[in-house]
């Protein structure tokens, strides 16, 4: 027993206060990160607090403003982009959000040499995507689903595509499903390294069924939003990849890149494009049944002005136990010979590791190994490879940055971050300058986040970029909850959990328990990161214990855990939450009559199924924007994990895994169902069907809809949502208001 001096009579203790819901809703304890906008090996741009764009030179220690806040304000710019020849800056204003990544905006081009905006041949508005070439100051942009090219900002545009049509043909930008579930970007065009070629995707959504929902707005009649959205088993977009020579775009026009024969024989997806050199490109393709991926390296044939993808340069990645890759199939990082590459995929023991592929995947050289996973390759230089993993001290929810010396044999490995600020920092990402001359480390916790600048050769810390001093001071008089990350061993499965405990936690007392769940395939909730959020408040002020559990289907602990849910979503994720709750009860400090569960999106699905599990464990629960049947969700995501909803494939489990099928089981729990009516992602249809099934079963429940809100329930809806959920939980747990 460790006796610690009590702070109860300490005068400092009396000034300490619990978190309030208002603190959370106001974002009082939000943190800042610093990601340099690198423009060379030793220079970066950063937008200062007063909105000047400042150039920092690490080696001289000097900085100067290249674009004043006055210029920014003159067009109400919220973002900027410097051309690689440093002659121009685009200024972005009138930001208008579309889906998760996509937005439209108005763009102005400012000439830094003369301090004036470029007049003549101004850009149309609104633009869907705009970017500089990697060299010089060519511009590519997408307007009304067509791609345009400018050799210089003041020049007239050259139109590359002509078939673009709203909701039908998308050029250079993804349709809904590719944006959300495959590319995770707002763009689908890629410049070659020196700007000679421009590659782009064309998505044909002509035959895709459309989801339609009402947007109520303020008018007499609601608008109808129509989105081509392929649900599980439906017709998918047809994708084609083209490449155009940007120096002579009219010469031969766009050239299509051939699809590998083994991919083209049935429905398929394009998953990513990586330029290797100006005349070599790497495309990744995926069968609709997503356990076979093909990486195809293509070369420009000068004589024919076409792209050739020899079968000898096709590399197949196949999974026999699940789907290909983790959440996405990983992308290659090419080495300096422009043919060999580094890539993360499963090793023979079922852990995702870095492999070096020189000729064939079969002859791949494994670079990392162990019962942990390599997560991201940041940079490969002539002599070093930088990557992140969760190896250190065997905590899957940590991220440290490692350097492997690939210039020496045998390669030596060094953890760059493991011992830097060990207590404060256990979850890092990194941002590298050209040739990894310098890099920034961004630490997300578990302590207060901090961003630092480092020398790429010695790893020496040069300076602190952002240490969140104001946040640190603001938290000095706050009673934050205690957090612990531990694991449960159950039937050969390791269940990692994070427990958030009230500030004066006493193991001899009984506390209400709230489970927060996400649980989607290849997700991770138990992470060593800093957060002051709603659940922090519930522990700090309302005295609840909150637990997050990573069960089967979650990531970065090997394929056995990850692929356990393959073709049977909604079973083991729920079982593992229930198992964990039983273990928490055994710990002795949980009031088993006051246990709740809540989740959002996939978490709303899991929380609904847990409430309807018939265990009697949960008194109440909340589902925000839940999936209720996998037949209602997007093809690309759903089929990756569930296969097709056809009789000869997996229709039976699609039917068995719905929330509606368990309507009767909600009779003995208090259920709060919440959804935005303009959810483009998990359609309101999901909650409408749950509500209908509950009504038909004559089961009482509570519900809240948010008019015209999407999957994020942002703005004032957020405040209303968390206030509403707080009241619901306090009532459930018999806590006074």
């Amino acid at each position: 027993i460790v006796l610690r001096p009590s702070r109860v009579h300490n005068s400092e203790e009396n000034t300490m206060r619990a978190l309030t819901l208002k603190d959370i809703l106001n974002g009082t304890f939000s943190y800042k990160t610093f990601f340099p906008n690198w423009i060379s090996g030793q220079e970066y741009l950063h937008q200062s607090a007063d909105n000047n764009i400042v150039l920092y030179n690490i080696e001289t220690g000097q900085s100067y403003t290249i674009l004043s806040n006055r210029t920014m304000k003159s067009v109400n710019a919220s973002n900027y982009g410097l051309s690689p020849d440093r002659q121009f800056v685009y200024l972005e204003s009138d930001y208008s959000k579309l889906w998760r990544y996509s937005y439209t905006a108005t763009y102005y081009i400012y000439d830094l040499s003369n301090g004036e905006f470029v007049r003549g041949n101004e850009l149309p508005r609104p633009i869907q995507y705009l970017c500089w070439s990697p060299v010089g100051s060519k511009l590519a942009y997408v307007y009304q689903n067509n791609i345009y090219l400018k050799q210089r900002p003041g020049d007239p545009p050259f139109q590359i595509t002509f078939n673009g049509r709203e909701n039908k043909i998308f050029n250079g930008i993804p349709d809904w499903v590719y944006e959300e579930e495959m590319l995770a970007t707002k763009y689908a065009l890629w410049w070659s390294p020196n700007g000679k070629f421009l590659a782009y995707a064309e998505f044909n959504d002509t035959d895709i069924p459309v989801i339609a929902y009402s947007y109520y707005g303020d008018e007499q009649y609601p608008r109808t939003i129509n989105i081509p959205y392929p649900k599980a088993g439906a017709k998918n977009p047809v994708v084609r990849i083209f490449i155009i020579d940007t120096t002579y775009p009219a010469y031969v026009g766009p050239q299509e890149v051939p699809v590998p024969a083994m991919i083209a024989s049935s429905d398929y997806y394009f998953s990513w494009l990586t330029w290797v050199t100006d005349e070599r490109v790497c495309l990744q393709w995926l069968k609709r049944v997503q356990n076979v991926s093909v990486l195809s390296i293509c070369d420009f044939r000068e004589d024919w002005q076409t792209w050739d993808c020899p079968k000898t340069q096709e590399h197949i990645e196949e999974s026999r136990t699940g789907w290909a890759g983790g959440f996405f199939v990983s992308t290659p990082v090419f080495s300096y010979d422009a043919i060999s590459y580094y890539k993360i995929f499963s090793d023979k023991d079922g852990y995702k590791h870095i492999h070096y592929i020189k000729d064939t995947v079969e002859n791949a050289i494994q670079i990392t190994s162990g019962k942990w996973e390599a997560i991201n390759i940041f940079r490969v230089t002539q002599d070093s490879l930088f990557y992140s993993s969760n190896e250190f001290e065997e905590y899957p929810g940590r991220r440290n940055i490692y350097r492997i010396s690939i210039g020496s044999y045998p390669p030596s490995k060094k953890c760059v971050t493991c011992h830097l600020r060990k207590e404060r920092c256990q979850y890092y990402t990194a941002s590298f300058s050209d040739y990894a001359k310098y890099y920034a480390l961004v630490c997300y916790g578990p302590g207060i986040p901090i961003s630092t600048l480092h020398d790429g050769r010695t790893d020496q810390e040069i300076k602190i970029l952002e240490e969140n001093k104001e946040l640190e001071n603001a938290l000095k008089n706050i009673q934050l909850p205690k957090e612990e990350i531990k694991k449960l061993e159950v039937d050969e499965i390791t269940l990692w959990y994070k427990m958030i405990l009230p500030p004066q936690f006493d193991r001899s007392k009984k506390y209400p328990l709230l489970i927060q769940v996400y649980g989607g395939p290849c997700s991770q909730s138990v992470r060593s990161v800093f957060a002051v959020n709603w659940i922090s408040y519930l522990a700090s002020k309302e005295g609840m214990v909150i637990a997050l559990v990573d069960g089967r289907g979650t990531a970065f602990q090997g394929d056995k855990l990850l692929y356990a849910v393959y073709r049977k979503l909604g079973v083991y994720e729920v079982e593992d939450q229930i198992t964990a709750v039983r273990k928490f009860i055994e710990m002795g400090f949980i009031d088993e009559k006051r246990i709740a569960i809540w989740g959002w999106s996939y978490g709303g699905y899991v929380s609904s199924l847990a409430l309807a599990s018939g265990t009697g464990l949960f008194k109440c629960g909340i589902a925000v924007a839940p999936v209720s049947s996998w037949e209602y969700y997007a093809s690309v995501y759903t089929e990756r994990f569930m296969g097709l909803p056809t009789k000869d494939d997996n229709l039976e489990h699609y039917k068995n895994s719905t929330v509606m099928a368990r309507a009767e089981y909600f009779r003995n729990v208090d259920y709060l169902l919440i959804h935005g009516t303009a959810d483009d992602n998990v359609h309101f249809q999901n909650s409408a069907q749950i509500a209908k099934a509950l009504v038909n079963a004559q089961v009482d429940f509570q519900a809240m809809w948010y008019s015209d809100q999407n999957h994020g329930l942002s703005g004032l809806s957020t405040n209303h949502l968390y206030t509403h959920m707080t009241h619901f939980l306090k009532q459930c747990f018999s806590l006074s208001d």
Epitope: S40, G41, Q42, E43, N52, L55, N57, E59, T60, Q62, Y64, T65, I66, L67, S68, T71, L82, R86, Q87, L112, S113, G115
Partner: nanobody
Framework: QVQLQESGGGLVQPGGSLRLSCAVS????????MGWYRQAPGKPRQWVAG???????NYVGFAKGRFTISRDNAKNTVYLQMNTLKPDDTAVYHC???????????WGQGTQVTVSS
């Protein structure tokens, strides 16, 4: 205080050559990206060429193949070798950081280049 002193301009016939120099003081030239800019009468100033701290040159379209930017870090000087000059190249040539500072930054007097027969 950073100071920039350009020299080497003059009158030259079309097709001729000039080598401009820019002496830099008050900063470590070797660590800064530097650029040459020009301003013709009644026209806005425009960028001509830039050089990174690693010595890599970048050029605007009209300068490619005719102009060469270089640096001598020991002498704290940046150069612009201009060949095959045309009457259109007539302007006052300035050097500065690349990109230049905003507002009313330090610009030297510049050096006048006149291409005429």
């Amino acid at each position: 205080q950073v100071q920039l002193q350009e020299s080497g301009g003059g009158l030259v016939q079309p097709g001729g050559s000039l080598r401009l120099s820019c002496a830099v003081s008050g900063t470590m030239l070797s660590r800064n990206a530097m650029g040459w800019y020009r301003q013709a009468p009644g026209k806005p100033r425009q960028w001509v060429a830039g050089i990174t701290s690693d010595g890599l040159g970048n050029y605007v379209g009209f300068a490619k193949g005719r102009f060469t930017i270089s640096r001598d870090n020991a002498k704290n000087t940046v150069y612009l070798q201009m060949n095959t000059l045309k009457p259109d190249d007539t302007a006052v040539y300035h050097c500065n950081f690349w990109p230049p500072p905003s507002g009313r930054p330090i610009w030297g007097q510049g050096t006048q280049v006149t291409v005429s027969s």
